[in-house]
């Protein structure tokens, strides 16, 4: 088992909004849960966009999940990762 490296980034979207992207990379096996939580509960699937789980060329995999949020409400969102029985949560950077 190779645990993922998880990185959260933010980028400007429309006025007053930002897109936050959670990337998991260099993990094996390929089964992974990567999702956004808002206010501690599940963020609805229709407000998230997922990338495919793809080989990254080193025998490991990578994927991502993104959502658009209101600027100033970053604290209310965390990216949740679960892989091979391990889990972690990742805040949006300021």
């Amino acid at each position: 088992t190779v645990p993922p490296m998880v990185n959260v980034t933010r980028s400007e979207a429309s006025e007053g909004n930002i897109t936050v992207t959670c990337r998991a990379s260099s993990f094996y096996p390929r089964n992974i849960i990567l999702t956004w939580r808002q206010d501690g509960v599940a963020l609805s699937h229709d407000t998230q966009q997922w990338g495919d789980v793809l080989p990254d060329g080193n025998g490991t995999y990578q994927t991502w999940v993104a959502t658009r949020i209101c600027r100033g409400e970053e604290q209310r969102f965390t990216c949740y990762m679960e892989h091979s029985g391990n889990h972690s949560t990742h805040p949006v950077p300021s």
């Epitope: 501690g40 509960v41 604290q75 949740y80 679960e82 029985g85 889990h87 949560t89 805040p91």
Partner: antibody, heavy 119, light 107 residues
Framework: DVQLQESGPGLVKPSQSLSLTCTVT?????????WNWIRQFPRNKLEWMGY???????NYNPSLKSRISITRDTSKNQFFLQLISVTTEDTATYYC????????????WGQGTLVTVSA | DIQMTQSPASLSASVGETVTITCRAS??????LAWYQQKQGKSPQLLVY???MLADGVPSRFSASGSGTQYSLKINSLQPEDFGSYYC?????????FGAGTKVEIK
Amino acid sequence: DVQLQESGPGLVKPSQSLSLTCTVTGYSITSDYAWNWIRQFPRNKLEWMGYINYSGTTNYNPSLKSRISITRDTSKNQFFLQLISVTTEDTATYYCSYYRYDGAWFPYWGQGTLVTVSA
Amino acid sequence: DIQMTQSPASLSASVGETVTITCRASGNIHNYLAWYQQKQGKSPQLLVYNAIMLADGVPSRFSASGSGTQYSLKINSLQPEDFGSYYCQHFWSFPLTFGAGTKVEIK
């Protein structure tokens, strides 16, 4: 360590308002987290009532929405529960608690305060 | 709202026994589940979060499992301090709801 302490009257008359205070020490309620009220009825059923978060946003249980208000006093690091038009069905032990945004589970609770609604 | 159904409502067990408590959600909660222990006259204490993760300081004789709508809490080699009531709680969506509890008593 975050510590929470509930206070308020132990007896309220039917049709009146129930008002409780949660005093938080060890952490500023404006820094982070969701600050919640949960109650436990005499037969031990637990009910999540609602929260006020670090920025003052509230979220209430729809079963209580027309009767509940959660507010705060940031200068005293306190948050409050008001429940209007109470009946004997609102007799319960009331707890304050908080959760972090990594998941809505409750790591620490206050000691609870029993409120009896009776004429 | 998601309803949480716990079973059994109560059980009697001896010190050293293994007990299992189950919790069923009315919909798929995708492991968004916590377990609490409550002793008489005290506040609930967090035991498990994210369906399987033990909270800080929880003894390893406790374990939890499940997925979808079915979850369980297992206590291996029950100790005197484990007697009390146990509650599950989902955090998939609002409103957050709890199971009705399982009371674990000394046989």
